[in-house]
């Protein structure tokens, strides 16, 4: 049969399984006369045979591993013997059969591992071989740990991959792994052949010795220093160290203060470089970082504390120069007069800043001294003694030393004795009505004045009259301001009306002292006044989430592709319907309903980034009021954009003939945006027939430089194609052309003679 | 009371088009979108647009963009639906329906339309 | 587009059941627009419940919703006669609004 298994002579590839007994032949070549025998040769190796009329066949079983391919040679030869056809060469492929197992290089393999070293980074590799086709299954290796001793809480500390053997740390490895408990471990290694996917795969076993090392890129414990330290700076306070040496240290200063007293050397020490003041700054936290010699973080940073120790370097402060007090001339022995609270900028609750009151002088010692006593801890004044009167004194002052455990300060006091507090306040009117007030109305406006009297002691603390909203104004939108002449209360709003939330509110107003009345008067319905709040409705257009909502997408986002969302609320509850309005461009449309901004045509960053359109919310139904809020879309770059010439190079000549061989320089930019480092342009020469007579040559990443290669040139234009690359993802090419006049020039400049003005060249080189 | 009432059974040939319209009563048409919704025999709800009868403003499920044209009359407080180019598988039941905060308050009755050669 | 999965597609229970119908989105929704509908054999959707939990105008408190994200439920306490229908839960969190495809609850 003619084609699959004989034909003519011709070059030829067999393909056969290694590992299988001949059971057919592989080819009969026909002879073509004069040719009646034919002859092999080649890499026969004793297995491959032709019979003298043409039949070819092996005797016995391939082995691909001892050769994969066998390059053989066949000729036909006359009735002398001699060639008439070829040799044509005749390839054997031994196809691969899994006839191999792996094999470990080593029967154990040993390594280390830090504590806490990254999950995933490997430290060791084991590796096995398998003589078999690794572009088959046959040889496709695959790794596995069979088991890790001691294994705890059924957690993996150690992975391997599959493909590589590379073995490294779990995550929880990373975060568990404590020589302190467990100095060392054992894996046992399996490795698969057929990709560890075949019930008849072969495979081979390996044991791995691991040995936890200890991790001594540890934070170290708070630092506390103490602050205005007289030692000579810098002084050391703590240390980091990395596992090996040669590593370089710096501090990070995560906070960015105006000053960083600290600094680490390249032993790992840190220090302080300066006094520290607790006042200015109580703690500190930073980071120590390690890096390798090329400036690579060798681990994560380390977070260093120092807690600055207070000591009692600020003295007591009184809260003003002088601080008034009123006390009733009928007070009772033992009643709070008040209570003179002096700061110390100390540490708080430390000896440093605990302070001692006491009464150092009292003016006028009548009618006798020690009238007023002050609780040594807490600085409440007291009536010690007797009742006041008016009329004898109607002012004390007190000098008060308050003092640390180091420093002492005076204060001063002065004390108004007042008529007796025994008089209420009484509204004029106990129902100030109904207030009907439109929601919108500006915050800070007055809306109500009313009015109490108090026919105590006028200008002090007895006849002034506070007053309060004590029910129907749980949100704080009233506030009531005293005028102190006039004890008149001007209700204002403080925070806006609201319709939907309070449309009918019922306020009562209390009208007290700030004295305590007198034993045996008190606060009646008098006190007390009351007026009804409702509120109208508004109808208040919808109010947007945001003033400016942003959105980033690439600019070469598909057409219909989600881009961004604004959200808008209509205080009245109605539905919304958006719309945008200055889209210039025509690239986006919203969802009237949701408020999901689409593209719905090309984006270009080089049009302009971002790109700025107004979003309207306007009401379904009611007023049809509406809002108006931005929003930006910000466009990020694709390389989408050829290089270009960055100007016109329209004017350029050589003066002819050439006296020696001249050059240009160009320029080259693109329209994409170039970070940091700017555009990377690599030029050449357009077409291969410009090289005879043209160079390009670059000087940076935007500049190159066009030269002449010999001085030969005609008196005519010439136009240099100019290759240039952007090498983007993906790289883009442009190709531009500078054309370059060679004339016959008059001072410097190209001559033409009359009549033969058109494109006059302006440059000359 | 607030109601959709739909216009009634159309059948149409492939390749036609069908207008279904939708006329609002006991509200004002301009005070809530207006969706349209179809049913296709034994099958689930698919929300094909909706049209803010306030301007004219509509957006439309990707599915029908370019074959379906939603518009309103204000004047009869009434909107409507056109799908162009009919093929079989829009035989279904169209509904209208009102909006309120984007949930679908008040429906028509539906209107079948088939679609046979 | 999000895609809303209900389950099961049918069920049957008897007058007094407790039911519960769980409708899944393939990505996150917002609970103000999620809604469910009841429908009748050759009658128009009526509204259940709207913004996943707020029971719709002349609804029997027996029904009642819940859920935040991507998993949302509805629950029938006690089923009466009248309750045997389909009922579909709808998103329109974001365009286009889509609906589940359905739960049929039968009379056992």
């Known amino acids: 049969q003619e084609g699959k298994f004989s034909g003519p002579l011709k070059p030829m590839t067999f393909s056969i399984y290694e590992g299988q007994e001949p059971s057919q032949i592989i080819f009969q070549f026909k002879a073509n006369p004069p040719a009646v025998t034919f002859e092999l040769t080649g890499e026969t190796d004793n297995i491959f045979v032709i019979e003298r009329e043409g039949l070819l066949y092996y005797n016995r079983a391939l082995d691909r591993e001892t050769r994969s391919t066998h390059n053989l040679q066949v000729a036909a030869l006359d009735a002398n013997g001699i060639i008439v056809e070829g040799p044509v060469p005749i390839t054997i492929k031994v196809k691969d059969i899994n006839d191999n197992r792996p094999t470990f290089l080593q029967s154990k393999y040993e390594g280390s591992v830090r504590q806490n070293s990254r999950p995933g980074k490997p430290f060791l590799y084991v590796n096995a071989t398998d003589l078999d086709d690794p572009a088959t299954p046959n040889g496709q290796l695959y790794y596995q740990i069979v088991i890790q001793l001691p294994m705890i809480n059924n957690v993996m500390y150690f992975q391997i991959n599959n493909k590589t053997g590379a073995i490294s740390l779990t995550r929880e490895g990373s975060q568990e792994l404590n020589p302190a408990k467990n100095p060392s471990y054992n894996l046992v290694i399996s490795v698969k052949d057929m990709g560890g996917q075949s019930e008849n795969s072969f495979s081979d076993t390996t044991s791995v010795d691991i040995i936890v090392t200890e991790n001594i890129w540890k934070a170290p414990k708070p630092v506390e220093m103490v602050e205005n330290s007289t030692d000579p700076h810098p002084i050391k306070i703590t240390q980091v160290r990395w596992n090996d040496p040669g590593a370089q240290y710096s501090l990070v200063d995560k906070e960015k203060l105006p000053r960083f007293p600290f600094s680490i050397d390249q032993e790992g020490d840190i220090y302080v470089t300066q006094p520290l003041d607790r006042e200015e700054k109580d703690a500190y936290v930073f980071y120590a970082v390690a890096k390798d010699e090329y400036g690579k973080p060798l681990s994560y940073p380390l977070e260093i504390h120092v807690k600055v120790k207070d000591i009692n370097d600020n003295p007591p402060t009184c809260p003003s120069p002088v601080t008034v007090f009123e006390v009733q001339e009928n007070e009772r022995l033992g009643n709070s007069i008040g209570t003179l609270t002096a700061h110390d900028r100390d540490e708080e609750n430390t000896a440093n800043s605990f302070l001692n009151y006491r009464i150092v002088e009292q003016t006028p010692k009548l009618p006798m001294d020690g009238l007023f006593l002050i609780q040594t801890y807490a600085g409440m004044l007291q009536l010690a003694k007797q009742s006041l009167k008016k009329q004898d004194t109607p002012q004390y002052n007190l000098t008060i030393e308050v003092s640390d455990k180091d420093f002492k300060t005076l204060c001063f006091v002065q004390i108004n004795v007042i008529d007796i507090n025994d008089q209420i306040p009484i509204f004029e009117k106990s129902d100030y009505g109904n207030l009907t007030l439109a929601e919108d109305t500006n915050i800070g406006s007055t809306i109500l004045t009313i009015q109490a009297t108090d026919a105590d002691e006028p200008f002090t603390g007895s006849s002034k009259i506070l007053y309060h909203i004590i029910k129907g104004d749980s949100e704080g939108r009233l506030g009531v301001d005293t005028d102190p002449h006039t004890n008149t209360g001007y209700v204002i709003i403080k925070k806006p009306l609201d319709f939907e939330t309070a449309a009918v509110s019922n306020i009562v107003f209390k009208a007290e002292n700030p004295e305590p009345l007198v034993f045996g008067v008190k606060y009646n319905a008098s006190s007390f006044a009351k007026f009804t709040l409702i509120v109208t409705d508004v109808n208040e257009a919808p109010q947007f989430s945001q003033h400016v909502f942003q959105a980033k997408v690439s600019e070469d986002v598909a057409i219909g592709t989600k881009v961004g969302n604004v959200t808008a609320k209509d205080p009245e509850g109605l539905d919304i319907s958006y719309s945008l309005r200055g889209d210039t461009r025509g690239w986006l449309k919203i969802d009237h309903v949701t408020g999901e901004i689409f593209s719905v045509a090309p984006l270009d960053r080089e049009a302009g980034s971002p790109y700025r359109v107004q979003v309207v919310a306007t009401e379904v139904g009611g007023s049809s009021l509406s809002s108006v809020s931005e929003f930006h879309l910000i466009l990020m770059d694709v390389n989408d954009n050829p290089p270009r010439l960055a100007k016109d190079y329209t004017g350029l000549f050589f003066c002819h003939p050439l006296s020696a061989p001249g050059s240009l320089i160009f320029e080259a930019t693109d329209d994409d945006q170039h970070l940091f480092r700017g555009p990377h342009f690599t030029f050449s020469l357009g077409s291969g027939s410009l090289q005879n007579d043209w160079e390009v040559s670059k000087i940076n990443g935007t500049h190159a430089r066009l030269s002449t290669r010999h001085t030969e040139f005609e008196e005519r234009e010439y136009v240099v194609l100019i290759r240039i690359n952007d090498g983007g993802r993906p790289p883009l090419e442009g190709i531009v052309s500078l054309p370059v006049t060679f004339c016959s020039c008059v001072e410097g400049s190209c001559f033409r003679p009359a009549g033969h003005q058109t494109g006059i060249p302006t440059v000359g080189m | 009371q607030v109601q959709l009432v739909q216009s009634g059974a159309e059948v149409k040939k492939p390749g036609a088009s069908v207008k279904v319209s939708c006329k609002a009563s006991?509200?004002?048409?301009?005070?809530?979108?207006i969706h349209w919704v179809r049913q296709a025999p034994g099958q689930g709800l698919e929300w094909m647009g909706a049209?803010?009868?306030?301007?004219?403003?509509?957006s439309y499920a990707q599915k029908f963009t370019g074959r379906v044209t939603m518009t309103v009359d204000t004047s009869t407080n009434t909107a409507y639906m056109e799908l162009s180019s009919l093929r079989s598988e829009d035989t279904a039941v169209y509904y209208c329906a009102r909006s309120f905060r984007r949930y679908f308050d008040v429906w028509g009755q539906g209107t079948m339309v088939t679609v046979s050669s | 587009d999000i895609q809303m999965t209900q389950s099961p597609s049918s069920l049957s229970a008897s007058v007094g059941d407790r039911v519960t119908i769980t409708c899944r989105a393939s990505s996150s929704v917002s609970s103000s627009y999620l809604q469910w509908y009841q429908q009748k054999p050759g009658k128009a959707p009526k509204l259940l419940i709207y913004s996943t939990s707020n029971l719709a105008s002349g609804v029997p408190s027996r029904f009642s919703g819940s859920g935040s994200g991507t998993d949302f439920t509805l629950t029938i306490s006690s089923l009466q006669p009248e309750d045997f229908a389909t009922y579909y839960c709808q998103q329109y969190s974001s365009s286009p609004s889509t609906f589940g495809q359905g739960t049929k609850l039968e009379i056992k």
């Open positions: 006991g509200y004002t048409l301009t005070s809530n979108n």
């Open positions: 049209i803010y009868p306030g301007n004219g403003d509509n």
